[in-house]
């Protein structure tokens, strides 16, 4: 779970140890603040649960790519 000590900076201290299927995902945000101990990705699920993940892991990168592709509005 992400932890906001001094809002609005949210940090992750532990990463999920299980791969989250893309069907469960709604969005993500990157955590890059120097106030946090490590870079992280926070996935938000379709039932509004927030899950910290390691951006170095391939499944995390693949999931972000997948969300990015499907979120893009096609140009007409």
């Amino acid at each position: 779970q992400p932890d906001a000590i001094n809002a609005p900076v949210t940090c992750c201290y532990n990463f999920t140890n299980r791969k989250i299927s893309v069907q469960r995902l709604a969005s993500y945000r990157r955590i890059t603040s120097s106030k946090c101990p490590k870079e992280a990705v926070i996935f938000k699920t379709i039932v509004a649960k927030e899950i910290c993940a390691d951006p170095k892991q391939k499944w995390v990168q693949d999931s972000m790519d997948h969300l990015d592709k499907q979120t893009q509005t096609p140009k007409t």
Partner: antibody, heavy 119, light 112 residues
């Protein structure tokens, strides 16, 4: 072919409990959240809650806390919902469903069971 | 809970004519992640509900492109460009931004 097959109609006594099932085929329930929705005769839809079949996590709408209990068995790819302390207010069709905004390839999906009538 | 108010509740339409259903929420459905979790369902007589539209305007697979969704914040619209006989049923808006998820009371579309 993706399908959610719910158990048959139930006729129950006031004060008793009933457990209805929702068997999935064509996909793995552990990759999804399973939801339950109530529809009283001639009425609208009410969301009951969801279960994460992978770890058993649940979340219930406040109205259904203590009334509904959701479980899942990943080995049989089946979700269950037990309703307790039944009254006439619980007479309804209950639907299981699963949905996503971002599927595995081309956008979202949503699947619904055929509904279980509890009288 | 977020209240979803649909209008009209009954919508008689002539075949081939357009139809429009409004859905208003008691609070903004714009989430902190910048997305708006507003969906539309169709329930034909005697059938289970079926999702038509998600994230305000995205059409589910297999849904005819005569259906479209639009809106933002608290005001949303489902449009059918040319109503066909198979469109008869009840249409619900459904929000997933705020807990608990809630549905509109439904709009019954019938053929005049």
């Amino acid at each position: 072919q993706v399908q959610l097959l719910e158990s048959g109609a139930e006729l129950v006594r006031p004060g008793s409990s009933v457990k209805i099932s929702c068997k999935a085929s064509g996909f793995n329930i552990k990759d999804n959240y399973m939801h339950w929705v109530k529809q009283r005769p001639g009425q609208g839809l009410e969301w009951i809650g969801w279960i994460d079949p992978e770890n058993g996590d649940t979340e219930y709408a406040p109205k259904f806390q203590g009334k509904a209990t959701m479980t899942a068995d990943t080995s049989s790819n089946t979700a269950y919902m037990q309703l307790s302390g039944l009254t006439s207010e619980d007479s309804a069709v209950y639907y299981c469903n699963t949905w996503a905004y971002y599927g595995t390839s081309y956008g979202g999906f949503a699947y619904w069971g055929q509904g279980t009538t509890v009288t | 809970d977020i209240v979803m108010t649909q209008s009209p509740l009954s919508l008689p339409v002539t075949l081939g004519q357009p139809a429009s259903i409004s859905c208003k929420s008691s609070q903004s459905l714009l989430d902190s992640d910048g997305k708006t979790y507003l969906n539309w369902l169709q329930q034909r007589p005697g059938q289970s509900p079926k999702r038509l539209i998600y994230l305000v305007s995205k059409l589910d697979s297999g849904v005819p492109d005569r259906f479209s969704g639009s809106g933002s914040g608290t005001d949303f619209t489902l449009k059918i460009s040319r109503v066909e006989a198979e469109d008869v049923g009840v249409y619900y808006c459904w929000q997933g931004t705020h807990f608990p998820q809630t549905f509109g009371q439904g709009t019954k579309l019938e053929i005049k």
